[in-house]
């Protein structure tokens, strides 16, 4: 607590402005009149403040709205926001994408902290959804925004959505968070052509099942190795080498570099060794002609 | 990472003048641009502060004689120091607020002899 004391004559301040860097703590304190400071909060990120000269200017605005600040003055804290916890942002109520944007301004090429992480889950409650726009503004700060959710998270995400969604958004998502996002892509993207389709679904492929990937091996889509790479090893396994001939195109020779590696050690320990000897890499590993292979999946089931 | 490049201090005889400048690299906006002093055993303290408007302020002990003003277009800061008194003798820091975050300059020494 800031004792109370009387404000010196003339001292009383009648604007927000750079002079009030010059008063003591105590003086800002008795000064300083809380409303007048919260219809001029804008003009506080001009000001270089000391961080004990903040913590006065958020003690006053804490007194003046003790059940949490108004948008009209979360809108404008800039780097205020950085003296803010985040049990003081539970208790607000941020509905417009402009009060987000400035508040991310602020920590603009910092890692997510507490407080941005607990203000983009109070905004994306409030919405209900992560809509669009709003992906798009936190992907556009958090390239990696995306892969910190939670499936449960995800579901919430719209396919429409999606269109927001760049390539890079995605490299630190895993398998469970793919497996959600997925089908939303394919929802998203299915009336485009063949191979806009496949530019557009690439990034999101870590999620495909088999079917899918035996359909797009009908399309001539050419996939490089590295999408090859992060599809789900259960989803590879069950495809052909045909097939997979036909998923990579021209960069079929790149299984041979891969050939150690998941998924394609444990798709290749799958094929008849006849059959991966037409791809003519000299691929090793695959079962020797003349040995039955057992699902022993498909036995389990029926037994 | 903002660098801050002060320049301009030096010793000087009580009654002179002195020009301190202070330039950063930031291609961020800047807020405001200021300088603080910290005599021997003394805490740091703000001098004068210029902000994105040009409005300017000044520590009471300074007013009418240091005047500080601002190069936009070189992002530079200048502090004109006239009528220095040995109580002026500190180290000159330049601050700069830039996209929401201070920065603080390696300071420069200023010294007035009686």
């Known amino acids: 607590e800031v004792e109370k004391t009387a404000c010196p004559s003339g001292k009383k301040a009648r604007e927000i402005d750079e002079s009030l860097i010059f008063y003591k703590k105590w003086e800002l304190e008795a000064c300083v009149d809380a409303a007048l400071l919260a219809t001029q909060m804008d003009r506080v990120n001009a000001i270089p403040f000391t961080y004990e000269q903040l913590d006065v200017l958020k003690h006053k605005l804490d007194e003046l709205y003790p059940q949490g600040y108004p948008e009209s003055v979360i809108q404008h804290l800039g780097y205020l926001f950085l003296k803010m916890s985040p049990e003081d942002i539970r208790k607000w109520n941020v509905t417009s994408l402009e009060t987000l944007k400035a508040l991310l301004e602020v920590n603009k090429g910092h890692e997510m902290s507490p407080q941005v992480a607990t203000l983009i889950d109070r905004f994306v409650k409030g919405r209900g959804q992560l809509d669009k726009d709003t992906l798009d503004t936190l992907t556009a700060f958090y390239p990696g925004y995306l892969c910190s959710l939670s499936p449960e998270e995800l579901s919430s995400v719209p396919p429409s959505s999606i269109w927001a969604v760049r390539p890079q958004d995605l490299d630190t998502c895993d398998p469970r968070q793919l497996d959600v996002l997925y089908p939303k892509a394919r929802l998203a993207f299915q009336n485009m052509n063949g191979s806009e389709y496949f530019v557009k679904i690439q990034s999101f492929l870590g999620g495909a099942p088999t079917e899918d990937l035996k359909a797009l091996s009908q399309q001539n889509v050419s996939m490089d190795l590295a999408t090859f790479m992060k599809l789900r090893t259960d989803a590879v396994l069950p495809l052909t080498v045909a097939e997979v001939q036909k998923l990579l195109g021209p960069h079929v020779e790149g299984l041979k570099a891969e050939e150690r590696h998941r998924p394609v050690r444990d798709w290749i320990l799958r094929q008849r060794q006849d059959d991966l000897d037409t791809l003519g890499l000299g691929l090793q590993g695959g079962i020797p002609n003349g040995y039955l292979v057992l699902d022993l999946s498909m036995q389990e089931a029926l037994s | 990472q903002v660098q801050l490049v002060e320049s301009g201090g030096g010793l000087v005889q009580a009654g002179g003048s002195l020009r301190l400048s202070c330039t950063t690299s930031t291609t961020f906006s800047i807020n405001s641009m200021s300088w603080y002093r910290q005599a021997p055993g003394n805490q740091r303290e703000p001098v004068a502060v210029?902000?994105?408007?040009?409005?300017?302020s000044y520590a009471d002990s300074v007013k009418g004689r240091f005047t500080i003003s601002r190069d936009n277009a070189r992002n530079t800061v200048y502090l004109q120091m006239d009528s220095l008194k040995p109580e002026d003798t500190a180290i000159y820091t330049c601050?700069?607020?830039?996209?929401?975050?201070?920065?603080w300059g390696q300071g420069t020494q200023v010294t007035v002899s009686s």
């Open positions: 601050h700069v607020i830039a996209d929401w975050r201070g920065y």
């Open positions: 210029i902000t994105n408007r040009g409005t300017t």
